[in-house]
């Protein structure tokens, strides 16, 4: 197979120049060289570096390779911070909350949107050609720390927040941003970067439009989004589906699958020391799994590990996320297929409203068909190499539940043996919130870390049971997660990328990189459980709460 | 196994029409792209047309645009080829296929795209 270059910009994907650079290890994370811009063009930039290349007889010291990053990059950072119009310090959901102390640390979040909103210099649109960054019309707020640029399925969370706060046309401009990469690339790529564009990211623009109406109510937005809407649908069904036989029928579902050539260009040191010693097509196949982990957001965990036995046991390269299946990509998708039949018929074109109904209706009808394990009773994601059950615990295993991806009737029917589950799995017994998996695997995508994205699908899914224990475990998930947050917000005066699920307000760690401060989808999702959940919620068991 | 059967093959004089079809044996139709391919004798097997799953989106071969229209029915799980203007260089073996799913990219006119195949209806465009 012809793979694809892992961008159109050599300097930042494919070259001898990005080769050299990371390896030296000129900065301890890989991310650094591919975020600088160029100060000369890309051909003068490429030409000089040969000719630098071959004068030191093609093996230039570290100090001579950071004199030339020196002189032909820099940092003069390609965003300004933004004021956003719509920003209040005092926004209306603040007066649901009845615990004082949540109520401060619902303010305290809500004054780090300005903190986190930023916009592209004229300059990246005028060059931009010299930049890894893509240049977007509309502000944005970023994760925070490393991530100075968009992510795609961060922004749901990003989104939710902001549209709790009353920030409706911040949101707005975020989702038109990522309306404008899809126009640019034919899909959205996992962030704002030129070095992201061959991979994407769990699709949840759909969901974002779908709360973004749900609390606008904006329809012209709908009516002159939903091309792209279905353009977005389309994108994995053109280039990530999958068949499944089980029981003799083949059914459709899909994967993270992104082949391009190389490395990852901000993780390149990475991963080029771990395919030393490999063949040339187990080093590209390790390329094309870990970028496919990559796009699934969970870089890395256990839940892509898999052996010859069929486990999860291993380490970074027994990665095969090609062979599979996830339950929360395809829970996603059935949800993003059920908005665009729900915005179609809001926008009265009942043959597509059927069309994409009928769409969702065959995903969920696969899901179950294919990921249900009805000994545990529990989705499970789904090895296709050995046409078996993955049966661990991962918080992503009820997505289904989390978008009304299952039968209602179905669902009556399981209740009690899925809340069963949930509960026995002991992925809700911790302190510090809801931890990904129960492996300690030393990647961030396992335990003891605590990502705010899965909590919040976690507390969605244990309420969409919709018994009344789902409904209180649900609260009583969402309540030890905002502990954990506020007490280290208490401690440490700022919010985390990841928690700690075995010590409340400590921040995870593990994989790539340091934790990052900020940051963008912990302060939406803790909003999203103030909004929900305020009249309930306490800071801590004295019920010490002055009703205001 | 995904089955497919093709029908409405035969014998047309230049300028006439023809329709082809091709019926899939399970549900799942309805999530795939579907194509048709020929193959003349001696020749390579090449591209005429194909369909996205939703039938919004049609792609063509620059040798038959404007007189083949390729549609489906998801309900019936059937693919058609509505064949106008024959001529005698349309005579081929017409084949039904699958993209069941992807092995890469999105190319729609490449036989390697395809995962099943039908066995094909003879078309003969003679006078």
């Known amino acids: 197979m012809d793979l694809p270059l892992t961008c159109t910009k050599p300097v930042y994907c494919n070259s001898n120049l990005l080769h050299q650079i990371q390896m030296a290890r000129l900065y301890n994370d890989s991310k650094t060289f591919v975020d600088l811009q160029m100060n000369f063009d890309e051909n003068k930039t490429l030409t000089d570096f040969e000719t630098f290349f071959n004068l030191h007889n093609k093996n230039p010291t570290k100090e001579q390779l950071m004199e030339f990053v020196n002189e032909y990059f820099s940092n003069d950072n390609e965003l300004e911070p933004w004021q956003p119009k719509d920003f209040s310090d005092n926004p209306a959901f603040l007066a649901k909350i009845k615990d004082d102390a949540l109520r401060e640390f619902g303010k305290g979040i809500n004054n780090i949107w300005p903190l986190l909103a930023r916009k592209v210099k004229a300059e990246v649109f005028q060059k931009p050609d010299q930049f890894s960054l893509v240049p977007l019309t509309h502000g944005f707020i970023i994760p925070g720390g490393r991530f100075k640029e968009i992510y795609y399925w961060d922004t749901f969370w990003i989104i939710e927040g902001l549209l709790i706060s009353g920030m409706q046309e911040t949101a707005k401009g975020m989702i038109e941003n990522l309306i404008e990469l899809l126009n640019l690339f034919g899909h959205i790529p996992n962030g704002s970067r030129g070095y992201y564009q061959q991979r994407s990211q769990p699709p949840m623009l759909n969901a974002m439009v779908a709360t973004y109406y749900m609390y606008t109510k904006d329809l012209e937005f709908l009516r002159n989004n939903i091309a792209y809407l279905e353009k977005e649908l389309d994108f994995w069904m053109d280039n990530r589906v999958v068949s499944v036989n089980r029981g003799g029928k083949n059914y459709t579902l899909l994967r993270y699958y992104a082949p391009s050539k190389g490395p990852r260009p901000e993780s390149y040191y990475e991963d080029y020391s771990n395919t030393e010693g490999f063949s040339e097509e187990d080093s590209t196949n390790f390329c094309i799994d870990i970028k496919s982990a990559a796009e699934s957001g969970w870089d890395f965990s256990t839940r892509w590990f898999l052996m010859p036995d069929g486990s999860n046991n291993g380490t970074l390269t027994d990665l095969h996320t090609r062979y599979i299946i996830p339950v929360d990509l395809n829970a996603i998708f059935a949800g993003a297929a059920q908005y665009v039949s729900n915005f179609h018929a809001l926008l009265k074109n009942p043959q597509k409203a059927a069309r994409y109904g009928q769409l969702a209706q065959t995903w969920r009808d696969n899901i179950q068909a294919v990921l249900w394990n009805d000994q545990d009773a529990m989705w499970y994601d789904f090895n296709i190499r050995d046409n078996l059950h993955r049966r661990y615990y991962y918080s992503s295993n009820a997505a289904p539940l989390w978008q009304n991806a299952v039968n209602p009737d179905f669902l009556k029917l399981n209740a009690d043996r899925i809340l069963k589950a949930i509960t026995e799995s002991g992925g809700v017994d911790f302190p510090g919130g809801v931890p990904t998996s129960l492996i300690r695997s030393g990647e961030q995508w396992d335990f003891p870390n605590v990502w705010p994205p899965e909590v919040s699908i976690e507390v969605a899914a244990i309420e969409n049971i919709g018994t009344p224990e789902a409904i209180t475990l649900a609260q009583e998930v969402a309540q030890t997660f905002v502990r954990s947050c506020h007490w280290g917000f208490q401690k440490y005066k700022q919010m985390f990328e990841k928690y700690d699920a075995e010590t409340p307000g400590r921040f995870g760690g593990g994989g790539e990189y340091n934790v990052q401060f900020g940051f963008g989808w912990s302060n939406g999702v803790v909003l999203e459980f103030l909004n929900k959940y305020g009249s309930q919620l306490t800071a801590d068991d004295s019920n010490n709460t002055n009703n205001s | 196994q995904v089955q497919l059967q093709e029908s409405g093959g035969g014998l047309v004089q230049p300028g006439g029409s023809l329709r082809l079809s091709c019926a899939a044996s399970?549900?799942?139709?309805?999530?795939?792209?579907m194509g048709w391919f020929r193959q003349a004798p001696g020749k390579e097997r090449e591209f005429v047309a194909a369909?996205?799953?939703?039938?919004?989106?049609?792609y063509y071969a620059d040798s038959v645009k404007g007189r083949f229209t390729i549609s489906r029915d998801n309900a019936k799980n059937t693919m058609y080829l509505q064949m106008n203007s024959l001529k005698p260089e349309d005579t081929a073996v017409y084949s039904c296929?699958?993209?069941?799913?992807?092995?890469?990219?999105?190319?729609?006119?490449?036989?390697?795209?395809?995962?099943?195949w039908g066995q094909g209806t003879q078309v003969t465009v003679s006078s």
């Open positions: 296929a699958a993209r069941a799913y992807s092995i890469g990219y999105y190319y729609p006119n490449a036989l390697s795209e395809y995962n099943y």
């Open positions: 399970e549900r799942t139709f309805r999530t795939y792209t």
């Open positions: 369909i996205r799953w939703n039938g919004d989106s049609t």
